[in-house]
Interface confidence: low
C-alpha cells in the first residue's frame, strides 16, 4: 500500500530535480573558471541536506548555510543588478552586459532558478506530488527560505553602486512585500554601498510619464535614504531599444534618450 503523504497546495518538486541541479552545477562550473574548484556532488549533498527528511514548513536559513558556504561568490563593485517582478528583462540584460550579475547569474541562483522542491519529515524521499504554497500553506517552506537566504547574502555582499530593475507596469512599482522590498533593500550595507540606482521599465510604448515620481518609488527612496545610501532613479521608456543599445552602444539612435 502506498504510504500516506502530506498534501500541499503548491505544485510538487520539479521532475528530475537532482539531475537538473547537478547538471546545472556542472555547466556553471565549466563556464565560470573562478568556480572550477566547486565539487558538484558536495553542492548537491548540501542542497539535499537542507530539506530532505525535514518538515517542509519548518525550514530555516540555518538549514541552507552549508550550501551557501559552498557557493560563496563575490560580485565586483558596481556590478550587482537586483530586480523585482521583471526577471526576464533583467536576465536578458545581463546576458548582453556580461559584466553585470543578477542573483540567477551566480551559482546558487542559477541552480535553483524556476525550480520547486520539498521533502517529507522523517523520510529520505523527495515529494514530487505537492509542496507548500507560500500563501496557502506556510512561508517557511524549502523554496521560499532558499530564496530569502541567498537573496540576503547577495545583497549583503554588494558594493559600490547597486542597480535594481523595477516593473513600471505594475500597480506597486516598488512592493515592500517582494523579495527585493522585504529582504534585499534591508541587507544592502551602507558602509559598502554608495548608491542604489533604480531603473523603472515602462510597459507601453506611448507611456511618457515620469514613473520615478510614483509614490512607491518615493517610498523606496525614503527607505534607502534613511539607511544612508544615496538613491537615483531612471525611466527606461523603451526596454526593447534599451537592450538594443546595450548591445550596440555606438548606434546613432542610442545617443538619444532611452
Amino acid at each position: 500500500l502506498p504510504r500516506w503523504r502530506q498534501q500541499w497546495s503548491g505544485s510538487g518538486t520539479t521532475s528530475r530535480f537532482p539531475e537538473t541541479v547537478l547538471a546545472r552545477c556542472v555547466k556553471y562550473t565549466e563556464v565560470h573558471p573562478e568556480m572550477r574548484h566547486v565539487d558538484c556532488q558536495s553542492v548537491w549533498d548540501a542542497f539535499k541536506g537542507a530539506f530532505i527528511s525535514k518538515y517542509p514548513c519548518n525550514i530555516t536559513e540555518e538549514d541552507y548555510q552549508p550550501l551557501v558556504k559552498l557557493g560563496t561568490q563575490t560580485v565586483p563593485c558596481n556590478k550587482t543588478l537586483l530586480w523585482s517582478r521583471i526577471k526576464d528583462l533583467a536576465h536578458q540584460f545581463t546576458q548582453v552586459q556580461r559584466d553585470m550579475f543578477t542573483l540567477e547569474d551566480m551559482l546558487l541562483g542559477y541552480l535553483a532558478d524556476d525550480l520547486t522542491w520539498c521533502g517529507e519529515f522523517n523520510t529520505f524521499e523527495i515529494n514530487y506530488q505537492s509542496c507548500p504554497d507560500w500563501r496557502k500553506d506556510c512561508s517557511n517552506n524549502p523554496v521560499s527560505v532558499f530564496w530569502k537566504t541567498v537573496s540576503r547574502r547577495f545583497a549583503e555582499t554588494a558594493c559600490g553602486v547597486v542597480h535594481v530593475m523595477l516593473n513600471g507596469s505594475r500597480s506597486k512599482i516598488f512592493d515592500k512585500n517582494s523579495t527585493f522590498g522585504s529582504v534585499e533593500v534591508h541587507n544592502l550595507q551602507p558602509e559598502k554601498v554608495q548608491a542604489l540606482e533604480a531603473w523603472v521599465i515602462h510597459g507601453g510604448r506611448e507611456d511618457s510619464r515620469d514613473l520615478c515620481q510614483d509614490p512607491t518609488i518615493k517610498e523606496l527612496e525614503s527607505i534607502i535614504s534613511k539607511r544612508n545610501i544615496r538613491f537615483f532613479c531612471k525611466n527606461i521608456y523603451r526596454p526593447d531599444k534599451f537592450l538594443q543599445c546595450v548591445k550596440n552602444p555606438e548606434d546613432s539612435s542610442c545617443l538619444s534618450g532611452i
Epitope: 547538471a23 556542472v26 565549466e30
Partner: antibody, heavy 123, light 110 residues
C-alpha cells in the same frame, strides 16, 4: 533506460582513417561529459579521450594526441571519434562511456558503457 | 605499463572474502576519487563503485570500496561464482589531465 550504441569499427590498413560514432538515448545527452575507452585484445582498459557536455573541453591520452579527434553533436545525441594515421597498436574494442554529471575531475567516473566496436588495423 | 597498479589475479572459494588493491600516486588516487569496474567475459565493463566507496543502485552490498592515501581497495565478501570476472580500478590523474586505469585483476573462484 540509458543506451549507448557504437558503430563505425572495422578493418583498416595502417595509415588509414575511421570515424566511430556513439548514438546515445535514454538520458539528457548534453548534461554529461562523454569518453572513449579502448581495450586491446586480451589486455586491460585504456582511457582514450573525453569531451565536456558542450564540447568546450577535450582531453586525450598522450599516445593519440594529434591523431584522434573527439567531438559531439548534441542535437543528434551522438558522440564521435575521428581516428587518423592508424597503427597496429590502435587495434582494440572501442567503448563509448557516459561520464558522471561532474565536470570536476575528482569525481569523474564512467557510469554507463556501450557494447563496443572493434577496430582492426592490419595490412 | 598502467599508471595504477593492481595484482594480476586473485582467487577465493565461494563464500570467502577477496580484496583487490590498487596503488597510485598523489596526482591520481591521492587527490582524486577512485572508481571500480567489473568486466564479465565477453561483455562491456560495468560500474561497481564510484567516489571511493559509493555503490550505484543495483550493485550488491557484497562489494565495497575504500581508500587510504594513494591506495584503494575493492572487497568482495561472500564470493559467488558469478563474481568471476576482471576488475579494474580507475581514477583521474591531475598531472596527465585524464583518466587512468589499473591493469586489471582476474578474480577466479576455486
Amino acid at each position: 533506460e540509458v543506451q549507448l550504441l557504437e558503430s563505425g569499427g572495422g578493418l583498416v590498413q595502417p595509415g588509414g582513417s575511421l570515424r566511430l560514432s556513439c548514438a546515445a538515448s535514454g538520458f539528457t545527452f548534453d548534461d554529461y561529459g562523454m569518453s572513449w575507452v579502448r581495450q586491446a585484445p586480451g589486455k586491460g582498459l585504456e582511457w582514450v579521450s573525453d569531451i565536456s557536455w558542450n564540447g568546450g573541453k577535450t582531453h586525450y591520452v598522450d599516445s593519440v594526441k594529434g591523431q584522434f579527434t573527439i567531438s559531439r553533436d548534441n542535437s543528434k545525441n551522438t558522440l564521435y571519434l575521428q581516428m587518423n594515421s592508424l597503427r597496429a597498436e590502435d587495434t582494440a574494442v572501442y567503448y563509448c562511456a557516459r561520464g558522471s554529471l561532474f565536470h570536476d575531475s575528482s569525481g569523474f567516473y564512467f557510469g554507463h558503457w556501450g557494447q563496443g566496436t572493434l577496430v582492426t588495423v592490419s595490412s | 605499463q598502467s599508471v595504477l597498479t593492481q595484482p594480476p589475479s586473485a582467487s577465493g572459494t565461494p563464500g570467502q572474502r577477496v580484496t583487490i588493491s590498487c596503488s597510485g600516486s598523489s596526482s591520481n588516487i591521492g587527490d582524486n576519487y577512485v572508481s571500480w569496474y567489473q568486466q564479465l567475459p565477453g561483455t562491456a565493463p560495468k560500474l561497481l563503485i564510484y567516489r571511493d566507496s559509493q555503490r550505484p543502485s543495483g550493485v550488491p552490498d557484497r562489494f565495497s570500496g575504500s581508500k587510504s592515501g594513494t591506495s584503494a581497495s575493492l572487497a568482495i565478501s561472500g564470493l559467488r561464482s558469478e563474481d568471476e570476472a576482471d576488475y579494474y580500478c580507475q581514477s583521474y590523474d591531475s598531472s596527465l589531465s585524464g583518466s587512468v586505469f589499473g591493469g586489471g585483476t582476474k578474480v577466479e573462484i576455486k
